[in-house]
């Protein structure tokens, strides 16, 4: 269940897509990563007030037992509900390859 | 990948399944549960320490680019990786009927 | 298969704008950039920019800024490229061509679309 | 911007001969792993360009093995090893190093 998309503390500030710019230096990947030298990296970024983008029952759960026992219970977390793929070239024993990945990139977020 | 369980910060202190006992009341289904009237309320709390319960490559992102800018992505966050089912006896217009939750109580967990 | 469809020509006054297509089909759209490169009648080939899908990021040669504004359509899986204020230079085959990123080579490209502008 | 010229513009052989075509960038184009951002293109009349050799000696798939990509930093070269009728083409090289791409001017291969 997909609920409310209405942030309540102002624009931006709820879990949502980000887009970071990273070389494969900061990613640790320029070992073996020859191509893209740089990748626009999407990720699931911001605070999950009560209901907000709730991925499901669990989400609501955590929610409810947070507002009771914030101690003890963290709000739920702004992660990717899908990814999109990414191919990247990488070097190989014997030259190089194409590889695709599916849990690269996400496309999309919720709280849970 | 399942990258490694071994928690730097010390035992316990790193991503896990926990219990909570919860409520009817604590969780908001006193007006539509009828039982459990108590649920030991299975979560995922901890800490997401460089690579430890890695989900996939988006969570091994996420620690690089987190270490680099850690003001502007947050750390990987601990969350289910799977799910247990639970039954519910609700109240219904009719009367009252058994329901099963697949997606309410957490079963294992991963960083991402 | 692995194909980017391109319609065949377009024929469009002086002035005047055009936004020409290019489907991708065979493959995940957003795990490619789409780049689109220009050649006129008997020349070489000019690139004019890219478009991440997954982002909508774009970046444009310095020659093509303010002449070319690209977009995409993910939901049909279609890029396009709009162009502005067309005069005779403009007048050529556009391809649309994927890669793995800005800096890749283009391993499928579209059949072109031909562009004449005349009045 | 980066310049490549290529040389000769145009050349005509007897199929079956061999064939070196050159590609001069105005600057280096070598990566850290000894790998070049230069690849080279095939274009039959009337139709689009086709990807022969990425990442200056890697052949496309399904590109006959008599084409080979050589060279390195500024100087690089498609050699055609023994020429086929259906090789009548323009051939370009183009850099991807910095942007904005660029592409040489072309070789037009011209069967006797």
């Known amino acids: 269940a997909r609920n409310g998309d209405h942030c309540p503390l102002g624009p931006g500030r709820c879990c949502r897509l980000h887009t970071v710019r990273a070389s494969l230096e900061d990613l640790g990947w320029a070992d073996w990563v020859l191509s893209p030298r740089e990748v626009q990296v999407t990720m699931c970024i911001g605070a999950c007030p009560s209901q907000f983008r709730a991925a499901n029952m669990h989400a609501q759960i955590k929610t409810s037992l947070h507002r009771l026992k914030p101690d003890t219970v963290p709000a739920p977390c702004c992660v990717p509900a899908s990814y999109n793929p990414m191919v990247l070239i990488q070097k190989t024993d014997t030259g190089v390859s194409l590889q695709t990945y599916d849990d690269l990139l996400a496309k999309d977020c919720h709280c849970i | 990948a399942r990258n490694g369980d071994h928690c730097p910060l010390g035992p316990g202190r790193c991503c896990r399944l926990h219990t909570v006992r919860a409520s009817l009341e604590d969780l908001g289904w006193a007006d539509w549960v009828l039982s459990p009237r108590e649920v030991q309320v299975t979560m995922c709390i901890g800490a997401c320490p460089s690579q430890f319960r890695a989900a996939n490559m988006h969570a091994q992102i996420k620690t690089s680019l987190h270490r680099l800018k850690p003001d502007t992505v947050p750390a990987p966050c601990c969350v289910p990786a799977s799910y247990n089912p639970m039954v519910l006896i609700q109240k219904t217009d009719t009367g009252v009927s058994l329901q099963t939750y697949d997606d309410l109580l957490a079963k294992d967990c991963h960083c991402i | 298969q692995v194909q980017l469809q391109q319609p065949g020509a377009e024929l469009v006054k002086p002035g005047a704008s055009v936004k020409m297509s290019c489907k991708a089909s065979g493959y995940p759209f957003e795990g490619w950039y789409i780049h689109w490169v220009k050649q006129r009648p008997g020349q070489g080939l000019e690139?004019?920019?890219?478009?991440?899908?997954?982002?909508?990021?774009?970046n444009h040669a310095q020659k093509f800024q303010g002449k070319a504004t690209l977009t995409v359509d993910t939901s049909s899986s279609t890029a396009y490229m709009q162009l502005s204020s067309l005069t005779s230079e403009d007048s050529a085959v556009y391809y649309c061509?994927?890669?793995?990123?800005?800096?890749?080579?283009?391993?499928?490209w579209g059949q072109g679309t031909t562009l004449t502008v005349s009045s | 911007d980066i310049v490549l010229t290529q040389s000769p513009s145009s050349l005509s052989v007897s199929a079956g001969e061999k064939v070196t075509m050159s590609c001069r960038s105005s600057q280096s184009l070598l990566w850290k792993h000894g790998y070049n951002y230069l690849d080279w293109y095939q274009q039959k009349p009337g139709q689009p360009p086709k990807l022969l050799i990425y990442?200056?000696?890697n052949r496309a798939h399904g590109v006959p093995d008599r084409f080979t990509g050589s060279g390195s930093g500024t100087d690089f070269t498609l050699t055609i090893s023994s020429v086929q009728a259906e090789d009548l083409a323009v051939y370009y090289c183009m850099q991807s190093f910095e942007t904005p791409i660029t592409f040489g001017g072309g070789t037009k291969l011209e069967i006797k």
């Open positions: 990442l200056d000696r």
């Open positions: 690139w004019m920019g890219w478009n991440n899908p997954r982002t909508g990021l774009t």
């Open positions: 061509a994927r890669g793995v990123g800005a800096d890749a080579a283009f391993d499928i």
